[in-house]
């Protein structure tokens, strides 16, 4: 069993639950955003291809004191397999463009909504 | 306690659209999954789909095209629509609570009969 | 989409009898099952989730058990508000999808 999820699940979940879980706290950090998110930081954009979520945590984790996406880097630790920590990056960022973090938690929601729907939970 | 009540129609015509509404007390939709599920005479249980804490919504691919599920937050109720419904939409229709981070439904309304029928 | 197959469609027991219904995923669902009960005009109601996990306030003459595929509930003595019919349900991937339902009846 999987703990997906990471510190953010209660315990081991299937894929689909913790893909919903994370959806909706995307979902969340959208439907909330008042003043620019983390402050305006910027982030490496990725390709939304297998092995999204390490990538997505790569970008991510090099952002600090930002709480608003604290629980989504918890969640995406849960789909990764490998530790990931600041300052480390895979092939699978596009590593010439930069967007606002904002832009970011769109693109990824809006490209996990489609799997979702799909069936491709794992 | 959380309870569910569902309420509509007993008789839709066929091509029209069917609409019910499920009221939430003891709870608040603003938190969990609320989700339909229907029951066919003589077929399996059917999941829907649902709407979240957050307004979210999924659906059965094989309803996508017939269903909308939406929420009034305000009366704390959800409802369900599905449109050009045909005898093969008769049914029981339940809706039912799933928490997050679970994939089970722990709390269930007694249901609706709905007759597609001219 | 997951098929689930519940066995068998119906049984006769008496109060007192070991009761055992099956479920069968069309492929594999790690323990995520769930069973549900439902008498006659009334609501379903959650028995057992994860297999083998006893709902809240439901009587320990319940039993869950299984992983994959295959699943078994088991009512140990059958009492005489246990006359209902069960539903297997799985939570792998959406959308979630019920076995047939298992109606035990009085003999």
């Known amino acids: 069993l999987t703990c997906l999820g990471g510190f953010a699940s209660p315990g081991p979940v299937p894929p689909s639950t913790a893909l919903r879980e994370l959806i909706e706290e995307l979902v969340n950090i959208t439907q909330n955003q008042k003043a620019p998110l983390c402050n305006g930081s910027m982030v490496w954009s990725i390709n939304l291809t297998a092995g999204m979520y390490c990538a997505a945590l790569e970008s991510l984790i090099n952002v600090s004191g930002c709480s608003a996406i604290e629980k989504t880097q918890r969640m995406l630790s849960g789909f990764c397999p490998h530790k990931v920590s600041a300052g480390q990056f895979s092939s699978l960022h596009v590593r010439d463009t930069k967007i606002e973090v904002a832009q970011f938690v769109k693109d990824l929601l809006l490209h996990l909504k489609k799997l979702f729907r799909e069936g491709q939970f794992n | 306690e959380v309870q569910l009540q569902e309420s509509g129609p007993g008789l839709v015509k066929p091509s029209e659209t069917l609409s019910l509404t499920c009221t939430v007390s003891g709870g608040s939709i603003t938190s969990d999954y609320w989700n339909w599920i229907r029951k066919p005479p003589g077929k399996k249980l059917e999941y829907m789909g649902y709407?979240?804490?957050?307004?979210?919504?999924y659906y059965n691919p094989s309803l996508k095209s017939q269903i909308t599920i939406s929420r009034d937050t305000s009366k704390n109720q959800l409802s369900l629509k599905l449109s050009s419904v045909t005898a093969a939409d008769t049914a029981v229709y339940y809706c039912?609570?799933?928490?997050?981070?679970?994939?089970?439904?722990?709390?269930w309304g007694q249901g609706t009969t709905v007759t597609v029928s001219s | 989409d997951i098929q689930m197959n519940q066995s068998p469609s119906s049984l006769s027991a008496s109060v007192g009898d070991r009761v055992t219904i099956t479920c069968h995923a069309s492929q594999n669902i790690n323990v995520w099952l769930s069973w549900y009960q439902q008498k006659p005009g009334k609501l379903p109601k959650l028995l057992i989730y994860k297999a083998s996990d006893l709902h809240t306030g439901v009587p320990s003459r319940f039993s869950g058990s299984g992983s994959g595929t295959d699943f078994t509930l088991t009512i140990s003595s059958l009492q005489p508000e246990d006359f209902a019919t069960y539903y297997c349900q799985q939570g792998q991937s959406y959308p979630y999808t019920f076995g047939g339902g298992t109606k035990v009846e009085i003999k």
């Open positions: 039912a609570r799933l928490a997050k981070w679970t994939w089970y439904f722990d709390i």
């Open positions: 709407i979240s804490y957050n307004g979210n919504t």
